[in-house]
Every structure is written in C-alpha cells, then in structure tokens.
C-alpha cells in the first residue's frame, strides 16, 4: 500500500434519462482514486457489454468512464438498452458504486387506438368528438386541428379533456375537417380526418 493511494469514489453520478429510439445518449460517470480506478457498468445486475468487449457494439465506454450509446436500440419486443444502470469504479483498495440511473426510451406508436368519427349536429346543439392517441412514453398530449390549423381552444365553447373535444353549442362556422394530434418528445401523430357537419 503506497501512502498516496486511496480507494475509488464516485465524483459524478449518472442521471435518469429519457431518450428517443435511434438517438445517441450518454450516462455520465466519473470516479477518483489512486491508482486510477477501472469503470464498469451494470444494468439489472448484469454487466453491460461495450466496445471493449466487442468493437461492433453500439455502446462505448468513454475514457472518462461514461457510457455512450451510439443509438438507443428499442423495439416492440426487443429492448436491450432500457433499464436501471449503475457504474462501478474499482482499484486494488476497493470499489465504489454510483447511484442508480434509469434509461427510459421515449416512444410514440403510429396507430391511433381510436380515430375520431364524423359528427352531424344542428346549429346550437353540442358536438363531441373523441380520440385515443397512439401509445407513447411520455404519455402523448392531445390537441386538435380544424381544416389543417390548430383549434382555437381559447373559445369558451370549446373544451378539450383527455381525448374528448366538446363544443357546447355549435355554430355554422364550426363545420369542417377535424384531426386529433398526439404529441410527445418523439414527435407528433395525426389521426384520420373526421368531418363535423352543422345543419341549419
């Protein structure tokens, strides 16, 4: 044991991440120690394979100790990158384990669970359209477009709650083509068009 040697300590812990499929990502980890500690990453108790194990890996162990993903791999069934990670720094005097960091993958499916249906109402009657956006993480927010433009939800007659668009009393000018839009950090998806017909 050399007098100036000391066991590892984590000086930068990884943080939770939400990343879109196919995008690059970095889980940071920095450790001090003498001799300089080696860094390994673990996910769900299993050591993470990096370019140090296989040069073709999409995960790289950076000189700093951070784990860099060239692109996040995530499918409907295969999800090798999602999970809870820790980095472990080791030298001959011991080891230090970082805080847990979760890597979540943001997704937005293509298919609406419910497309809005055409509605026909008389002037002054209430109108309701309903949609369920594609599954997504984070949960997609819902907005509506009328004739290709964002719907003016400042109009006190119009309420958007969950997937429901409610117009308390319709005017002739409300008639048109409506589209439900689901949005999260991945992007946006538009439903099929639903026609609102307002009869005199």
């Amino acid at each position: 044991l050399r007098q100036e040697d000391f066991p590892p300590r984590i000086v930068e812990h990884p943080s939770d991440l939400i990343v879109s499929k196919g995008e690059p990502a970095t889980l940071n980890c920095k450790a001090e120690g003498r001799p300089t500690p080696t860094i390994e990453w673990y996910k769900g108790g299993e050591r993470v394979e990096t370019d140090k194990d296989d040069p073709r890996s999409h995960r790289m162990l950076l000189p700093s100790g951070s784990l860099f993903f060239l692109r996040i791999v995530h499918g409907r069934k295969s999800r090798p990158d999602e999970g809870v990670y820790v980095c472990v720094a080791r030298n001959y005097l011991g080891e230090a384990v970082s805080h847990n960091a979760s890597l979540e993958v943001a997704i937005l499916r293509d298919d609406f669970r419910q497309n809005p249906s055409d509605v026909m109402v008389a002037v002054g009657e209430p109108a309701v359209m309903e949609c369920q956006p594609p599954r997504g993480h984070p949960e997609p927010t819902i907005s509506w477009k009328k004739d290709g433009s964002p719907l003016d939800d400042k109009d006190e007659r119009i309420t958007i709650r969950g997937g429901k668009l409610m117009i308390t009393y319709t005017r002739k000018s409300d008639a048109g083509k409506y589209v439900c839009v689901g949005t999260n950090m991945v992007g946006e998806r538009e439903s099929e068009v639903a026609e609102l017909t307002v009869l005199e």
Epitope: K21, D54, V73, K77, S78, P80, D110
Partner: antibody, heavy 118, light 105 residues
Framework: EVQLVQSGAEVKKPGASVKVSCKAS????????MHWVRQAPGQGLEWMGW????????EFPQKFQGRVTMTRDTSITTAYMDLSRLRSDDTAVYYC???????????WGQGTMVTVSS | DIVMTQSPSSLSASVGDRVTITCRAS??????LNWYQQKPGKAPKLLIY???SLQSGVPSRFSGSGSGTDFTLTISSLQPEDFATYYC???????FGGGTKVEIK
C-alpha cells in the same frame, strides 16, 4: 460475432416430443426477443411464437397453444423450443431468430431438421 | 389474425431485369413490414426492415416501399445471386407471406 447455433437434427415417432436448443452468443441475450419459425419441406415460413429472455414470458399463435413450450436458461444464453404430441406434418426445419430493436428478425440460427415418422 | 398475401407466388426474370414483388396485409400494419431472402438449404436473410429501411450489408439494388396495407419489394437490376425465394413478414403481431420464388427465365 453475433450468432445463434442450434442443436442437431432429430428423428421422432408420432406422439413423441422434441426439444430444440438455440445457443446465443456475441450480444446481450436478455435484451432481445427470441422467436421460433418453422418451414415444412417445400413450404413457406410459419411463425411459432416468441419468448422474452429477460422475463421468460411467451406468446404463441392459437395453432400452437398447448403443444409448444418455450423456455430459456440465461446463465448459458440458450433458448429452447419443445413441441409435444408430434405428427407427421410437424416434419420441418425449425429456426430460432433474434428480433432486433427494429422489429425484424436480423439473426437466424442455421436450422434444425425434425423428421416425424413411424 | 393478420393475413399477409404475397404476389406473385413465382416469377421468371432475366439478369438485369427490374423485379417487383407485392405484399398486402388484411388490416393496417403501419410500417411494421420486413422482407427476407431465402436460398435453398439456408436460413432466411433480412433485406428490408420497417417497410423501407435497407439492412446493413444489403446491396442498394433492393428497396422497399409502402405503409398501411400495401407494400412492395423492388430489385432494380436482378443479379445472378438474387434468384431465391422472398418473404414478407409483418411485425405488428407477426406472420409471414406465402413467399415469391424468383426463377431464371
């Protein structure tokens, strides 16, 4: 190198069972869904089901429910497909295939010929 | 169950020809459609995933298009090594088309 290596050819009698193994190497076994696909002589590809190697959860089309069992041993990165009550029309080449993060079968085993004959 | 209908079931073509194979799903599968090539006695090989993305290492003469229910695999200029059977597969719930055998004219 990412690869799937399957067990050797089998000859079975009608009514018997067969267990085919698929040894994965070169990737994180628990991270990728494993599917089984079969191909009768001169016929097309038929999907038999899949297993989530992390959880062991399986899913099969109606046709194979009750007759097929899929398991895995994560300690030796191997998936297994067990087909029971064999009939002559189960004679086929059986493939394991890894599903990529792009929802496609990017890596296939070499295939295992199973012959069912009395 | 989603049924995948591939056409034609077989075709004859010459080296240099442009070849088109179609695949129709019985309901919308968005872009969850893959194409495979299989040669006798070999395992299938992935060519195209997500309807139009070329798998790494696959020649650029192969291309895919379509979304929803109708999809196409195109070989822009058929090469001798392309004579094989081609399968579409939907990964929405998983099933294969019946295959298209590309033979030498």
């Amino acid at each position: 190198e990412v690869q799937l290596v399957q067990s050797g050819a089998e000859v079975k009698k009608p009514g018997a069972s067969v267990k085919v193994s698929c040894k994965a190497s070169g990737y994180t076994f628990r991270g990728y869904a494993m599917h089984w696909v079969r191909q009768a002589p001169g016929q097309g590809l038929e999907w038999m089901g899949w297993i989530n190697p992390r959880s062991g959860v399986t899913e099969f089309p109606q046709k194979f429910q009750g007759r097929v069992t899929m398991t895995r041993d994560t300690s030796i990165t191997t998936a297994y497909m067990d087909l029971s009550r064999l009939r002559s029309d189960d004679t086929a080449v059986y493939y394991c295939a890894r599903e990529s993060g792009d929802d496609a079968f990017d890596i296939w085993g070499q295939g295992t010929m199973v012959t069912v004959s009395s | 169950d989603i049924v995948m209908t591939q056409s034609p079931s077989s075709l004859s073509a010459s080296v240099g020809d442009r070849v088109t194979i179609t695949c129709r799903a019985s309901q919308s599968i968005s872009s969850y459609l893959n194409w495979y090539q299989q040669k006798p006695g070999k395992a299938p090989k992935l060519l195209i995933y997500a309807a139009s993305s070329l798998q790494s290492g696959v020649p650029s003469r192969f291309s895919g298009s379509g979304s929803g229910t109708d999809f196409t695999l195109t070989i822009s200029s058929l090469q001798p090594e392309d004579f094989a059977t081609y399968y579409c597969q939907q990964s929405y719930s998983t099933s294969f088309g019946g295959g298209t055998k590309v033979e030498i004219k």
